[in-house]
């Protein structure tokens, strides 16, 4: 019979024949032959392979180094790598999450649009007219100006993006 030019899923072509790939969590020791099956071996502790493969070496688990602000989000297994995230108040510097930086604070005049997570930084937005923020914070949104009218008061000092309005008593009309 003609030697195959393509193989089924979870197989690979070697020496004109189709061999079974090793399952996730195992590495290749020897290719199959006419008479023997593919020989695979489990990955060692703290190693993994996450696909059907013909790798001769397993990959090492990622180390979530606490000195870099990292912590384990998901423990590694023979079939999956360790997933790292950042300690509270920090976020990853890249998608691979190899180190962490402190969450950014929004300056006065800006409020938090989106609170930071372990993988994304704080998103700030300028306080629009009618809102203010007088603190530097990683959590505070822009606050609406105080409504003097609802308190039967009048605006004595206009608000800005950094300060609230100042309310005062209405001037009594003289007789």
């Amino acid at each position: 019979p003609e030697p195959p030019t393509a193989c089924r899923e979870k197989q690979y072509l070697i020496n004109s024949q189709c061999c079974s790939l090793c399952q996730p969590g195992q590495k290749l020791v020897s290719d199959c032959t006419e008479f023997t099956e593919t020989e695979c071996l489990p990955c060692g502790e703290s190693e993994f392979l996450d696909t059907w493969n013909r790798e001769t070496h397993c990959h090492q688990h990622k180390y979530c180094d606490p000195n870099l602000g990292l912590r384990v989000q998901q423990k590694g297994t023979s079939e999956t790598d360790t997933i790292c995230t950042c300690e509270e108040g920090w976020h990853c510097t890249s998608e691979a999450c190899e180190s962490c930086v402190l969450h950014r604070s929004c300056s006065p005049g800006f409020g938090v649009k989106q609170i930071a997570t372990g993988v994304s930084d704080t998103i700030c937005e300028p306080c629009p007219v009618g809102f203010f923020s007088n603190v530097s914070s990683a959590f505070e949104k822009c606050h609406p100006w105080t409504s003097c009218e609802t308190k039967d008061l009048v605006v004595q000092q206009a608000g800005t993006n950094k300060t609230d309005v100042v309310c005062g008593p209405q001037d009594r009309l003289r007789a």
Partner: antibody
Framework: EVQLVESGGGLVKPGGSRRLSCAAS????????MHWVRQAPGKGLEWVAY????????YYADTVKGRFTISRDNAKNSLYLQMNSLRAEDTALYYC????????????WGQGTLVTVSS | DIVMTQSPDSLAVSLGEKVTMNCKSS????????????LTWHQQKPGQPPKLLIY???TRESGVPDRFSGSGSGTDFTLTISSLQAEDVAVYYC?????????FGAGTKVEIK
């Protein structure tokens, strides 16, 4: 037969130090991750620390971070726990336990060694 | 940290009766890569160290009698002893094997009525 034998426990004064050992036999020690887990008298289990088979990865519980150091000597089939700045709340039976690369669970435990921190 | 909550704290059951205990985790123990729940059960008999009973929620460790079974997923798990034997008197601990720090439940003590 897999055997894990802890030693080094005893009475220590608060602020003192102690080094625990765990002698492993009956398996290829260098192929396994290892843990220390403790159990205060009459209480439940508390994980303390982990070290990977090749010494590359080490994790600690927050309660012992900066005070305890886990290490291993694969040539001597031994696991260690160096305990410094000991506190009364560290009083417990300390177990070493093995973690394999398949289950990723603690599949064998030693008998434990008792550390008592008291003045 | 993941908090493991076991219930009940203790239970007394007649020999041959069915025993059910529960374990709840404060977050999912499902590994997104291999779709296994990393929930482990350990048995600790009086005066002895813990012994691995069940891993990956429902896989019995070699040598563990088939009267022991585990079930559940995500955050809710159950250990069942189908017919209690005298040698099953112990404290049973569930454990988060999903992430560090590894955390244990406070245990469920099983006694004979």
């Amino acid at each position: 037969e897999v055997q894990l034998v802890e030693s080094g426990g005893g009475l220590v004064k608060p602020g003192g130090s102690r080094r625990l050992s765990c002698a492993a036999s009956g398996f290829t020690f260098s192929d396994y991750g290892m843990h220390w887990v403790r159990q205060a008298p009459g209480k439940g289990l508390e994980w303390v620390a982990y070290i990977s088979s090749g010494n590359r990865i080490i994790y600690y519980a927050d309660t012992v971070k900066g005070r305890f150091t886990i290490s291993r000597d694969n040539a001597k089939n031994s696991l260690y726990l160096q305990m410094n700045s000991l506190r009364a709340e560290d009083t417990a039976l300390y177990y070493c336990a093995r973690q394999d690369g398949y289950r990723y669970a603690m599949d064998y435990w030693g008998q434990g060694t008792l550390v008592t921190v008291s003045s | 940290d993941i908090v493991m909550t076991q219930s009940p704290d203790s239970l007394a059951v007649s020999l041959g009766e069915k025993v059910t205990m529960n374990c709840k985790s404060s977050q999912s123990l499902l590994n997104s890569g291999n779709q296994k729940n990393y929930l482990t059960w350990h048995q600790q008999k009086p005066g002895q160290p813990p012994k691995l009973l069940i891993y990956w929620t429902s896989t019995r460790e070699s040598g563990v009698p088939d009267r022991f079974s585990g079930s559940g997923s995500g955050t809710d798990f159950t250990l069942t002893i189908s017919s209690l034997q005298a040698e099953d008197v112990a404290v049973y601990y569930c454990q988060n094997d999903y992430t560090y720090p590894l955390t244990f439940g406070a245990g469920t003590k099983v006694e004979i009525k």
